[in-house]
């Protein structure tokens, strides 16, 4: 659901705020087929926008437009840039396009600035998981107005998201689009609920969060707002104490027996067949650990029946 | 004393029942395959059954379906129960180890210890 | 299946003696998975050899086993009284056969 309500903003001269969105897509949090090359976790660059309720950049449970789309499948902005754009100067419902350059590691942080004012008071933007079949985290639609005041400040936990642009599965899945299209559906621990999505987690109630976000109201000041450095990786810089970063169990996964080996021996001691499996998922953070990948049988040898 | 007892035999009629019975000692008895083989009155010998540690068995099939081998470990005993009983059967029936133990060591790969045998006539 | 064929049927010789067993399977006994068994009235057979050479635990040496594929030979170097008995060859290669057996016997 939006963020925002229909309440009537009734806030004096328009606001400034920093946008600091924060990855929190470590190895730890989601052991889970967590992508270390090419390319590794990462995130592509921000790009929002301050708006009316006319306009929705995405929303949940709807359809998403072309751009959304070539945004979240490829991280390409011109779609989205062209449709925000649009709808500012059809329906004067935008007021103003903010961006961050991308977060090179599945942790780390960049900012932007952004203006928000009474007609134009909700924001919304997105960031696209990368690498992903059609995956996003984002706002829709938070209102910076609280009556005839601006908010000091906004912290959101974000969750990801899928397009339902691409039936992918996993962070690596190859191009697979969704025919007909689906509208956005959450990501969370249980759903999809196939255990080969890379988000499948049936241990856990809910998902992590993937990554925060945090608006803070910029006082006008004589001094030039310096905005924070665009880009600080969290192993350098990380601004949540690493206790509190969540230690996501990961299970043990292996395959299925593969069929009997021949039976080994003769017809006085009889013999003994084997049959193995292998690893699909190692453990991480204290998961289930793997059972034995090799399993003997005692057996009749073929030529003593 | 590594040795094995044999009870259980005596004389039955034709399409009748009878429970053999071998108990092991002086040796880890579920460690060992074990069989059972017999030999007809002034002939040679013939290979029954054979049952492994893990339970897998084994028939000749001459007695396929009549004859059922099982063994007890906790009691350290093989058993041999035959029905179905036919002239033919009729001979001195063995219990035997087969002397192969362990992981890479062949140490008597064969039939090494024997029970001293019991008798099962099978008459009208 | 493999038959296993002994001869001579009956040997017949005197305490001191060389005696010299045969058995001729049907087919080749792989690996040499072969045995031989002392059986004497009344008494259950007793392991002699395995793996066609392999003298069995507290066998004398004057027992000996030879051969592979399909010829095979138990050998007694001098024969003391206690030798004269039926002796079975035996085959673990595939299923499990035994020889008619060979009768030695005081000459």
């Known amino acids: 659901q939006p963020l925002g309500g229909e309440s009537i903003c009734s806030a004096g001269a328009p606001a400034k705020y920093s946008i600091t969105f924060t990855g929190k897509w470590s190895q730890t949090a989601f052991p889970k087929q967590y992508p270390l090359f090419r390319p590794p976790a990462q995130w592509s660059s921000l790009l929002g926008a301050a708006h009316s309720s006319d306009y929705s950049m995405w929303r949940k449970n709807q359809y998403v437009s072309n751009g959304l789309r070539d945004f979240a499948e490829r991280g390409e902005a011109w779609a989205l840039m062209k449709e925000i754009e649009a709808a500012g100067e059809a329906l004067q419902s935008v007021h103003a396009v903010f961006s961050a350059p991308a977060v090179p590691s599945g942790t780390g942080q960049t900012s932007a600035e952004l203006e928000v004012q009474r007609r134009h008071s909700l924001v919304s933007f997105v960031v696209r998981i990368v690498p992903s079949p059609d995956w996003f985290v984002g706002v829709d639609s938070l209102d910076l107005c609280d009556g005839d005041r601006w908010r000091e400040q906004a912290a959101l936990d974000l969750y990801p998201y899928d397009a339902g642009t691409d039936s992918g599965f996993t962070f690596s899945s190859p191009n697979f689009a969704t025919i007909p299209q689906d509208t956005v559906t959450e990501i969370t621990s249980s759903s999809p609920s196939h255990p080969a999505n890379s988000f499948y987690y049936p241990r856990l109630k809910a998902l992590p969060p993937i990554a925060r976000v945090t608006l803070v109201r910029l006082r006008q000041s004589p001094r030039a707002f310096i905005p924070p450095a665009p880009v600080l990786p969290s192993r350098d810089n990380e601004i949540v104490d690493s206790a509190s970063v969540p230690e996501t169990p990961l299970d043990c996964e292996v395959s299925l027996w593969s069929s009997w080996g021949l039976c080994g021996g003769h017809c006085g001691r009889l013999g003994t067949k084997s049959r193995t499996r292998y690893v699909r998922v190692q453990p991480a953070n204290n998961g289930s650990p793997c059972p034995e990948l090799e399993e003997e049988a005692e057996c009749v040898p073929d030529n003593c029946v | 004393e590594v040795q094995l007892v044999q009870s259980g035999g005596g004389l039955v009629h034709p399409g009748g029942s009878l429970r053999l019975s071998c108990a092991g000692s002086?040796?880890?008895?579920?460690?060992?395959?074990m069989h059972w083989l017999r030999q007809a009155p002034g002939k040679g010998l013939e290979w029954v059954s054979v049952?492994?540690?893990?339970?897998?068995?084994h028939y000749a099939d001459s007695v396929k379906g009549r004859f059922t081998i099982s063994r007890d470990n906790a009691k350290n005993s093989l058993y041999l129960q035959m029905n179905s009983l036919r002239a033919e059967d009729m001979a001195m029936y063995y219990c035997?180890?087969?002397?192969?133990?362990?992981?890479?060591?062949?140490?008597?790969?064969?039939?090494?210890?024997w029970g001293q045998g019991t008798m099962v006539t099978v008459s009208s | 299946e493999i038959v296993l064929t002994q001869s001579p049927g009956t040997l017949s010789l005197s305490p001191g003696e060389r005696a010299t067993l045969s058995c001729r399977a049907s087919?080749?006994?792989?690996?040499?998975?072969l045995a031989w068994y002392q059986q004497k009235p009344g008494q259950a057979p007793r392991l002699l050899i395995y793996?066609?050479?392999s003298r069995a635990t507290g066998i004398p040496d004057r027992f000996s086993g030879s051969g592979s594929g399909t010829d095979f030979t138990l050998t007694i170097s001098r024969l003391e009284p206690e030798d004269f008995a039926v002796y079975y060859c035996?085959?673990?290669?595939?299923?499990?056969?035994f020889g008619g057996g060979t009768k030695v016997e005081i000459k």
């Open positions: 035997a180890r087969w002397g192969y133990y362990g992981s890479g060591s062949y140490e008597n790969d064969a039939f090494d210890i």
């Open positions: 002086g040796f880890t008895f579920s460690s060992y395959v």
């Open positions: 049952i492994g540690t893990g339970g897998v068995t």
């Open positions: 087919q080749s006994v792989s690996s040499s998975y």
């Open positions: 793996g066609a050479s």
């Open positions: 035996q085959q673990y290669s595939s299923s499990l056969t």
